[in-house]
Amino acid sequence: KTLVLGKEGESAELPCESSQKKITVFTWKFSDQRKILGQHGKGVLIRGGSPSQFDRFDSKKGAWEKGSFPLIINKLKMEDSQTYICELENRKEEVELWVFKVTANSDTHLLQGQSLTLTLESPPGSSPSVQCRSPRGKNIQGGKTLSVSQLELQDSGTWTCTVLQNQKKVEFKIDIVVLAFQKASSIVYKKEGEQVEFSFPLAFTVEKLTGSGELWWQAERASSSKSWITFDLKNKEVSVKRVTQDPKLQMGKKLPLHLTLPQALPQYAGSGNLTLALEAKTGKLHQEVNLVVMRATQLQKNLTCEVWGPTSPKLMLSLKLENKEAKVSKREKAVWVLNPEAGMWQCLLSDSGQVLLESNIKVLPTWSTPVQP
């Protein structure tokens, strides 16, 4: 018995060859002897039933002269999985057709961190093995159900699943979209008084995007977190529902999600969590955003540089006179110089020599007041 593997929705060609290598009478039947189609000597294809019933079945007339009488089944269905009989030259050829399908669990658009389940639809009696390769080249192998937990952004793209049955292969391609923000976390460094821009770009594009979101903010100086803004998303249009009065936030009306804080102030320094709930999706998308604010001041004979917000312990805060070595450099959130000499002083926040934030303050001779450019 010949085995042919097919993919649901596609076409399969079931072979039937004559030893004569020339046109001859042939008939294709179901295993219960119902006739599908055939050729009875006049070179005309005769179907075994009404056109509507048999419109998916065909043969290759061009191959008949070469002694080949294939049965073509179009738009394959799972229930086409059965034994087909080709009768020619007083013999019967049995061809077993197994139709397979690989589906993703409920949806091909999944939230980051969710699980992807790939299910092989297979006919009874088949004993397939499946191997699926993710877009980043990771292979998973198993029986009729394969699961990948904790989907990552790199899992977005085309998954290729190979079904192996009796040394024959059939390949499926499934496009998976992992719904996530481009960055899980971001940090913004600003001098006091500067305008702050927060951006939350999505790592996917879809026709229509509907949902709702909220930004909760935990200021370093505050004892509890506070909802800064809530908004709706309708077909990629953003509409603000509720916004805090302090700070006076503004939100862009289009994607990517974009927030503007008019002034960076020490009392706003801290961490925020933007949550986006998408329509018809269980679970939410999250992006963390952090704000670090720097202030340089001179009070009487003390020049001070301070930062507020979530800084890592390895960050270095320095005070230096322009074009000179740092006067003070510490892994602290505040540094100061007593009786600073006149000139342009720089306050620098750096990470392994790379400057993240810089604030300049001009120290005038002792008889005048300081100038902050």
């Epitope: 799972m78 669990n105 639809e121 297979s122 006919p123 009696g125 397939p128 029986g143 009729k144 192996l164």
Partner: antibody, heavy 125, light 107 residues
Framework: QVQLVESGGGLVKPGGSLRLSCSAS????????MNWIRQAPGKGLEWVSY????????FYTDSVKGRFTISRDNAKNSLYLQMNSLRAEDTAVYYC??????????????????WGKGTTVTVSS | EIVMTQSPAALSVSPGERATLSCRAS??????FAWYQQKPGQAPRLLIY???TRATSIPARFSGSGSGTEFTLTISSLQSEDFAVYYC?????????FGQGTKLEIK
């Protein structure tokens, strides 16, 4: 532990309907293909229907085609068999059974490893 | 549809003795073949799958052999709990079919 419990059987008149349920526990139901198998009184076993883990692929034995409908609800860990136009010859104990598999040298072997205790359906006037 | 024929229909054997049950398929089913044991009022219990692989927690006295169309279940030394009805079944293609059963009785 792995368990399948059938319910919904009973006495019904010819032409009537019944809905059998099978409640699964102790395993990830949504990962497994499921089956209904029946056994007429004092007779042998007969396969009735087969459903894939997602519920997309379904097969029936010829004698029940068009009358019986197999379905599943993975969220509820439940398998169902809706039986319409019942006949006297449908009288049997109906078993719910799980399709298991083993893997040997990357070859997969499928078999029916876990069965419920069965529920009795009697079709009589 | 593949027809499974079991022989004998009934078999009387004394405890401690060997029992051999046969099953023939009307066409080749490769090794997609299983044996089940059923006791009165109970569901069938899988003994052997893939023609020769013992299912979990099945004693070593049960063994299966054969391929294609001829299959054998051997119980090397019968215990009192082994007296039951035994069914063979193929799972080569749809519909899966069972044999009519062999009743193993105490002699």
């Amino acid at each position: 532990q792995v368990q399948l419990v059938e319910s919904g059987g009973g006495l019904v008149k010819p032409g009537g309907s019944l809905r059998l349920s099978c409640s699964a526990s102790g395993f990830t139901f949504s990962d497994y293909y499921m089956n209904w198998i029946r056994q007429a009184p004092g007779k042998g076993l007969e396969w009735v229907s087969y459903i894939s883990s997602s519920g997309i692929t379904i097969f029936y034995t010829d004698s029940v085609k068009g009358r019986f409908t197999i379905s599943r609800d993975n969220a509820k860990n439940s398998l169902y068999l809706q039986m319409n136009s019942l006949r006297a010859e449908d009288t049997a104990v109906y078993y719910c059974a799980r399709e298991d598999y083993s893997n040997y040298e990357d070859h997969y072997y499928y078999y029916t490893g876990v069965w419920g205790k069965g529920t009795t359906v009697t079709v009589s006037s | 549809e593949i027809v499974m024929t079991q022989s004998p229909a009934a078999l009387s054997v004394s405890p401690g003795e060997r029992a051999t049950l046969s099953c023939r398929a009307s066409q080749s089913v490769s090794n997609k073949f299983a044996w089940y044991q059923q006791k009165p009022g109970q569901a069938p219990r899988l003994l052997i799958y893939n023609a020769s692989t013992r299912a979990t927690s099945i004693p070593a006295r049960f063994s299966g052999s054969g391929s294609g169309t001829e299959f054998t279940l051997t119980i090397s030394s019968l215990q009192s709990e082994d007296f039951a009805v035994y069914y063979c079944q193929h799972y080569n293609n749809w519909p899966y079919t069972f044999g009519q059963g062999t009743k193993l009785e105490i002699k």
